[in-house]
Interface confidence: medium
């Protein structure tokens, strides 16, 4: 099949890196500067993406394959094969319509990107709040409030070690 | 073909004005939301402002009630009016064509002038 398609269309010859010249007979002609075709068989060359602005140059294009793209610092990539930059925020804080704002009280976000979200509420899960939480960082839970009564230790105990022959109840 | 001028910048005492133009060719640009970032010596690049084709502004905290964005479609022309200037002002100062209108992203088909130096010393 492969050599009866070669028979009917000479441009499935021409390899990736080269386009069919229909201008010169058909001939496989290589890729014009800033552009690549990485597959056999093609027409045409693409273009290039060029990488400009807040992008900057992860992989140079080729004659076979395209270049790639990332953010210059300062900013991360959203969408696929990283069509846009966004500005990063510092930590406790989040990108709104007016730039990066802090978090407000009672929310947090640890990282450069994302929104800032509600601490834990211990209480749904009947924990103490052990550490508060601020903008960058979320409260840390500890032990139940009962488990804190007077006279009980705030450190839970290691488990009584099981005699052989016991099951556990 | 897209192009951006930016003008304008230069060296000025904290505490003064500069008015930043952006002459734009090879779009529409009254349809056309813009932009102006900065980038600061050895930081990275900032969003300060931007102006939507319907007028609306926004603007950076830091720079609110100093810096005023407007256009003049008319003349093709984009602004950023600067008072009040501070030293933490001094940066190159990019004007954008801008596509994905959410404050702080930029599209890779956004288009971007070559920038103008404004420095805040005295």
């Known amino acids: 099949f492969e050599r009866t398609r070669s028979l009917q269309d000479p441009c499935s010859n021409c390899p990736a890196g080269t386009f069919c010249d229909n201008n010169r007979n058909q001939i496989c002609s290589p890729c014009p500067p800033n552009s690549f075709s990485s597959a056999g068989g093609q027409r045409t060359c693409d273009i290039c993406r060029q990488c400009k602005g807040v992008f900057r140059t992860r992989k140079e294009c080729s004659s076979t394959s395209n270049a790639e793209c990332d953010c210059t610092p300062g900013f991360h990539c959203l969408g696929a094969g990283c069509s846009m930059c966004e500005q990063d925020c510092k930590q406790g804080q989040e990108l709104t319509k007016k730039g990066c704002k802090d978090c407000c009280f009672g929310t947090f976000n640890d990282q450069k990107r994302g929104i800032c979200r509600p601490w834990t509420n211990c209480s749904l899960d009947g924990k103490s709040v052990l550490v508060n939480g601020t903008k960058e960082r979320d409260v840390v839970c500890g032990p139940s409030p009962a488990d804190l009564s007077p006279g009980a230790s705030s450190v839970t105990p290691p488990a009584p070690a099981r005699e052989p022959g016991h099951s556990p109840q | 073909e897209v192009q951006l001028l930016e003008s304008g910048g230069g060296l000025v005492q904290p505490g003064g004005s500069l008015r930043l133009s952006c002459a734009a060719s090879?779009?529409?640009?009254?349809?056309?939301?813009m932009s102006w970032a900065r980038q600061a010596p050895g930081k990275g690049l900032e969003w300060v402002s931007s102006i939507y084709s319907s007028g609306k502004t926004y603007y950076v905290e830091s720079v609110k009630g100093r810096f005023t964005i407007s256009r003049d479609n008319s003349k093709n022309t984009l602004y950023l009016q600067m008072n009040s200037l501070r030293a933490e002002d001094t940066a190159v100062y990019y004007c954008?064509?801008?596509?994905?209108?959410?404050?702080?992203?930029?599209?890779?088909?956004?288009?971007w002038g070559q920038g103008t130096l404004v420095t805040v010393s005295s």
């Open positions: 954008a064509k801008w596509k994905t209108l959410r404050v702080g992203v930029w599209d890779e088909s956004d288009y």
């Open positions: 090879g779009f529409t640009f009254s349809s056309s939301a």
